[in-house]
Interface confidence: medium
């Protein structure tokens, strides 16, 4: 089951999955000036069998200006830009990804990959938060979030992390002891907020054109 939303945003923090549950999808995105190869994969998929998990499909980008030339070379370190969605700005070691059954490792970069990685997570996925450089972590509880299924809806637990603007950086995933705080509202597993995620969408004409256009809306 795919998680309906992205993990929560914490001011001045980024998140990282140490390993990706089977079913996770990573979009094949290319940086500006490049595009997916024709009939190339839309996304990579973490799949598994009885013995191991791995990423199905490969992402390939080619120059928008050229035709029928593709490469798939691991970039040199200086070419690997920050990835906003899930890549941290400081080193991390906490989990041996290979030791987690039913999970895939972080996919290796592909040439001319976009700077932002867009993952589509599945229920049960855990992500870890860390303050960005220049901010210090004040923990009020776990600095992690888990995608859970509650009453037929998916939701991410709220990480209890505050990043303050002090010029100290914490180690990932956070070496400070959690501090009990009356303001830190615990996650409720029993109460249900009644919400609707039954999407409805409606198109409308936003502008007129220089050539004449007649519109009819199907109801």
């Amino acid at each position: 089951e795919l998680c309906d939303d992205d993990p929560p945003e914490i001011p001045h923090a980024t998140f990282k999955a140490m390993a990706y549950k089977e079913g996770t999808m990573l979009n094949c995105e290319c940086k500006r000036g490049f595009r997916r190869i024709k009939s190339g994969s839309l996304y990579m998929l973490c799949t598994g069998n009885s013995s191991h998990s791995s990423w199905d499909n490969q992402c390939q980008c080619t120059s928008s200006a050229t035709r029928n030339t593709t490469k798939q070379v691991t970039p040199q370190p200086e070419e690997q830009k920050e990835r906003k969605t899930t890549e941290m700005q400081s080193p991390m070691q906490p989990v041996d990804q290979a030791s987690l059954p039913g999970h895939c490792r972080e996919p290796p970069p592909w040439e001319n990959e976009a700077t932002e990685r867009i993952y589509h997570f599945v229920v049960g996925q855990m992500v870890y938060y860390q303050c960005v450089q220049g901010y210090r972590a004040l923990h009020r509880g776990p600095a992690e979030s888990v995608c859970k299924m509650t009453h037929g809806k998916t939701r991410w637990t709220q990480p209890q992390l505050i990043c303050t603007g002090e010029m100290e950086t914490s180690q990932f995933p956070g070496e400070e002891k959690p501090q009990a705080s009356p303001e830190g509202r615990p996650e409720s597993e029993t109460s249900c907020l009644v919400t609707t995620t039954d999407f409805q969408i409606q198109t409308e004409m936003a502008a007129t054109m220089e050539t004449s256009i007649f519109t009819t809306e199907y109801q």
Partner: antibody
Amino acid sequence: PSGTLSLTCAVSGGSISSSNWWSWVRQPPGKGLEWIGEIYHSGSTNYNPSLKSRVTISVDKSKNQFSLKLSSVTAADTAVYYCARGVRGTGFDPWGQGTLVTVSS
Amino acid sequence: TQSPGTLSVSPGERATLSCRASQSVSSRLAWYQQKPGQAPRLLIYGASTRATGIPARFSGSGSGTEFTLTISSLQSEDFAVYFCQQYTNWPQTFGQGTKVEIK
């Protein structure tokens, strides 16, 4: 022709910032479906190569809507234009009701 | 490629629609139903998983390049155009459609 087609899709019943891709698909009268492009709430876009030079899709998170602009339209762009939510790995669901756009010179 | 282009079937009979991909799409294929003047409706995704609210008479099968949509016993409301869509290769594409009409 120098006209630009502009359509907006309003999302209700959920947030456009959810983990979905928001797509535009068109269907010329009596013909099949053609995927135009998609946008993620972060602003990432993907366009059909056959239309890429003329297409711009944008998102307005504050209004929970996304928009399509198609430039240099001709009669060949006459179609019903649909917006749809795209969930990776499962296809498009739901769809907007569609807007018939007729281009004439 | 979808076949046949048009399928004439009597109510209560079984209808079998085919969709063939030019290259493997694994099991990442969806089926849609479209009635005149309406938007398409998702029936099947992942080649064989029924979407929410879709009756059990609709079933999908296949993987790789050959896929089938089966309607076990056609009801009057099932007469429509059916499209397949692959969403693993770039760009995602639709079949040209199969019209299921009353015989």
